[in-house]
């Protein structure tokens, strides 16, 4: 008789998902000497041991302490780009200026990047078939704490400077309710963050509007005034050319506004 | 239990090629690295290269580059190691080892090839 | 490539005795060092990695420190199923490179 399982909204877990957590580590660990101290099966070990057998709508950030602790790493917190719907392009622009890191560039951001997982209660399987929604099912998924919990320790350890890309070409240019809105603005640390920039990108090719005056990033500035910490807002009118001028920077064409 | 069973003893002609292989048991076979490590006759240990099975991707040492080739076959969860243009100094035992970081935890019981004319 | 020097080349040991071999990196390696015991006809054991960590299942006779280019392992007192050949791995800088080797003989 097959076991009765809940039906989730959500896709389930992304396949072999283990397999690719522990290939993703292993490389990682291989590129970043800094982190090659870190034994990927322990890592593994602890990402199982966050979900596995747990009630996937019951997930604590405390059941990720393991994990984030044997993935601790220091990058330059004057060098941090946050993002907001907007991943491609960020993750482009920190493979070209090298020197800047997205969550996506640290080893727990690179690990989970694009997969889904979540477990069954009292079983130790990993659910394949549906994985919980954040809108229909619940926010307490292993997914969204996870995402959760490593993006908020990325916005505190982030210092001086930080850049934040935004899509220009979305209604809400700004988003309270994204993760940018809803967990980094509020833990950048206004004792060790000066100000906070952000880059609006622009879709349209012949969209020569001031994107910094839409009302989303005059709450964002708002936001932010408030927690002691300045704001500047910049447009990115060409993004192809803003990517194209990062890697040449002694173009002739680069001196113009992009 | 992870194990790593390596194929048996060869014999080989110089100019020829060698492929080696090592079937692992356990579980998430993909997801680690498989290296290969050899061993002279009374020497020490050389690692060779590693493929990661999940990602297809290789790394070989300087040394060997161009005449080794690692490869994976996931379905039956075995990684194979072929050196070609053998000379009598590749005469050595041939070991599989898998890691999950810089480290082998697990090894092949290792491969005898000898190259002899 | 790194190179790694093991010293001594051969060391004579009574059983019950404390046994210390050494390990030299010609650059830093961190903390990013193993070692492995060898005996004759088989695989190699994985004792230490990360310079001081013991592998699952190794007594705790086994002792590994150092860091940057200096490294030993310490055997406290050993046993006769210790007589080997050990090696160090370094895993710092590609490609991982081990020393020659240290063969601990019975006395």
């Known amino acids: 008789v097959p076991r009765w399982r809940q039906q989730w909204s959500g896709p389930g877990t992304t396949k072999r998902f283990p397999e690719t957590v522990l290939a993703r580590c292993v490389k990682y660990t291989e590129i970043h000497p800094e982190m090659r101290h870190v034994d990927c099966q322990s890592v593994w070990d602890a990402f199982k041991g966050a979900f596995i057998s747990k009630h996937p709508c019951n997930i604590t950030e405390e059941d990720y302490q393991p994990l984030m602790k044997l993935g601790t790493q220091t990058v330059p917190c004057n060098k941090i780009l946050l993002w907001s719907r907007i991943k491609d392009l960020a993750h482009q622009f920190t493979q070209v200026q090298r020197d800047m890191f997205t969550l996506e560039d640290t080893l727990l951001g690179y690990l989970a990047d694009d997969l889904t997982w979540c477990g069954e209660f009292n079983t130790s399987k990993i659910n394949y078939q549906s994985c919980p929604d954040w809108r229909k099912d619940c926010s307490n998924n292993p997914v969204s704490v996870f995402w959760k919990t490593v993006s908020r320790r990325f916005a505190e350890a982030a210092c001086d400077v930080v850049h934040v890309m935004l899509n220009g070409s979305r209604s809400k240019i700004f988003d309270k309710n994204s993760t940018f809105g809803s967990v980094e603005v509020h833990n950048l640390q206004p004792e060790k963050v000066q100000t906070l920039e952000a880059w609006v990108i622009h879709g349209g090719r012949e969209d020569s509007r001031d994107l910094c005056q839409d009302p989303t990033i005059k709450e964002l500035e708002s936001i932010i005034s408030k927690r002691n910490i300045q704001f500047s807002c910049k447009n990115i009118y060409r993004p192809d050319k803003f990517l194209q001028c990062v890697k040449n920077p002694e173009d002739s064409s680069c001196t113009s506004e992009i | 239990q992870v194990q790593l069973v390596q194929s048996g003893a060869e014999v080989k002609k110089p100019g020829s090629s060698v492929k080696v292989s090592c079937k692992a048991s356990?579980?998430?076979?993909?997801?680690?690295?498989i290296n290969w490590v050899r061993q002279a006759p009374g020497q020490g240990l050389e690692w060779m290269g590693r493929?990661?099975?999940?990602?297809?991707?290789?790394y070989y040492a300087q040394k060997f580059q161009g005449r080794v080739t690692i490869t994976a076959d996931e379905s039956t969860s075995t990684a194979y190691m072929e050196l070609s243009s053998l000379r009598s100094e590749d005469t050595a035992v041939y070991y599989c080892?898998?890691?999950?970081?810089?480290?082998?935890?697990?090894w092949g019981q290792g491969t005898l090839v000898t190259v002899s004319s | 490539e790194i190179v790694m020097t093991q010293s001594p080349a051969t060391l004579s040991v009574s059983p019950g005795e404390r046994a210390t071999l050494s390990c030299r990196a010609s650059?830093?390696?961190?903390?990013?060092l193993a070692w492995y015991q060898q005996k004759p006809g088989q695989a190699p054991r994985l004792l230490i990695y990360?310079?001081?960590t013991r592998a699952t299942g190794i007594p705790a006779r086994f002792s590994g420190s150092g860091s940057g280019t200096e490294f030993t392992l310490t055997i406290s007192s050993l046993q006769s199923e210790d007589f080997a050949v050990y090696y160090c791995?370094?895993?710092?800088?590609?490609?991982?490179?081990f020393g020659q080797g240290t063969k601990v003989e019975i006395k």
């Open positions: 080892a898998r890691s999950a970081a810089g480290w082998f935890a697990y």
């Open positions: 356990g579980d998430f076979f993909s997801g680690y690295a």
């Open positions: 493929i990661i099975p999940l990602l297809g991707d290789t």
């Open positions: 650059q830093s390696v961190s903390s990013n």
């Open positions: 990360g310079a001081s």
């Open positions: 791995q370094q895993y710092n800088n590609w490609p991982w490179t």
